[in-house]
Interface confidence: medium
Amino acid sequence: EAYKSEIAHRYNDLGEEHFRGLVLVAFSQYLQQCPFEDHVKLAKEVTEFAKACAAEESGANCDKSLHTLFGDKLCTVASLRDKYGDMADCCEKQEPDRNECFLAHKDDNPGFPPLVAPEPDALCAAFQDNEQLFLGKYLYEIARRHPYFYAPELLYYAQQYKGVFAECCQAADKAACLGPKIEALREKVLLSSAKERFKCASLQKFGDRAFKAWSVARLSQRFPKADFAEISKVVTDLTKVHKECCHGDLLECADDRADLAKYMCENQDSISTKLKECCDKPVLEKSQCLAEVERDELPGDLPSLAADFVEDKEVCKNYQEAKDVFLGTFLYEYARRHPEYSVSLLLRLAKEYEATLEKCCATDDPPTCYAKVLDEFKPLVDEPQNLVKTNCELFEKLGEYGFQNALLVRYTKKAPQVSTPTLVEVSRKLGKVGTKCCKKPESERMSCAEDFLSVVLNRLCVLHEKTPVSERVTKCCSESLVNRRPCFSGLEVDETYVPKEFNAETFTFHADLCTLPEAEKQVKKQTALVELLKHKPKATDEQLKTVMGDFGAFVEKCCAAENKEGCFSEEGPKLVAAAQAALV
């Protein structure tokens, strides 16, 4: 159906509240440096305009595309040149080039300080004083820090955030109520951001086919009773939704996501028996619930995979006449039978199957050639299984902090050219896989661990792309999406690395370290560990353990001292000298 006014169409579909929220998110993701007040003003103006178009679709400018309207609005910002430099040049371009230009200037690492919550009474006063403004500020702060955040999901989290405050601001002990709830929400939001960034990277760097394959595998595991046609339909729609959100088309994205939720609920009988509860909820919760829904039980009567994909004499005909559809069916059938496999592994198996058919269908006797194809999957399955087993054992032995440090050492040796903050951030996140996945039952471990690692390694790839410093990182990031993790796992110590010059300033600590929260204290210590390794890349694990132990004792001693700053300035240089001597 063609609409006279696209903006009126979206305003009517989404409703004023969601419309305004999405516009605020869109502007905050594009102009990450602008103050909150500016964005509120822009969002208000666009919403008023949309409202007018909804009342009179043939009004002035109502027929313009959303990109034109949004771009024109962005280009009215007076401080564009000062704050964003060459991003202002985007305004010289015509659509669609102008929007592409804005997208290219999104900054994955804008360097804003972490969000620190004021004390609870002040927060509750602000919440009760102006709820809408309070939630708008939340949308703004998350969106500008995470320019690829999945916008409809951010609206859902803002709703959750509102719920937390509505409840906790009535509590006797506001701090005790807010603390754990806000922290739990923060964890979810950070994971959601990283997952969507991974989806956007798959679409942008590897194309629709890669994203669709990933989605077929994931949805086939989750909805094993649905047939391939149903999975394909949902995947096609889901791909459109994520393409829109990744491309900054947040209104279309949210609208299409709501349509997809509606479709799934209307067709739940042919998708999954687990959707009923989700489908009774309002739109934001419904979509979120569907995205997180538990896996359906496997149908009991699944025939052997071999019948269709190995024993059948028509395999090559099927493959050659419709390659993607045939491989999609294979992926679907394999995934629904193996909920315990990671999506990455399933995609590697499909790739191996494809390579086997490419080779065998060109021979004189294809059936003999591909007869053992399913047996050849064993090493591909064993590799992540062994990796998870070994690393979970290490995690159980060392705990999260110790495991993070082991990964820091591992990754710094693989790619010592990468910036220290990036190595610390990524290794800390990789280390969380232990806490997140190792306590799960055996049947869920691999899927949890490897798919989480893919998301974290994507963060490394995104940050590294901004300032490429290591050819081997570039190679692992760009060659194959599904083989990223094995590629990084397979990297050995970089023997070509020239050690960094020693800089005393890097190893100078002050009394402010003592008052930092535990997590930030860990980051300081881990930063020192990386710098130490960059200076002495040949250091053994034993030597590093000794030096880090001494360092921990030094921090503990000085933080307990009467004159903390004096202790740091006196004992610090001694520790550094001892460390240098120990690492010769």
Epitope: A226, D227, F228, A229, E230, I231, S232, P303, A307, D308, F309, D312, E314, V315, K317, N318, E321, A322, V325, F326, G328, T329
Partner: nanobody, 126 residues
Amino acid sequence: EVQLLESGGGLVQPGGSLRLSCAASGRYIDETAVAWFRQAPGKEREFVAGIGGGVDITYYADSVKGRFTISRDNSKNTLYLQMNSLRPEDTAVYYCAARPGRPLITSKVADLYPYWGQGTLVTVSS
């Protein structure tokens, strides 16, 4: 669920033609891999022809190649089997079978088709 209903069978002379139809309900036929099987008295059920769902790849048993044509009309949600140059050995009950959500027929094995019609009798005799 998929319901299938065959029609168009009957008595025909050798060398004659017949067109069988199979009306599907409960699922769009273009999303479903469908096939015709036949069973002659005292014999195993055998694959005759098939067509992929989502992609129109057709398959034929060697014994009917060049004589039979499988097709479907998505707007009518119906599958057809056009049978020309009929021979006495084509006499059998013809069944329509479906594998929903399968984009390709990847098997001629009857057991892999969960949905079947009740069959229509074709007799080729002078």
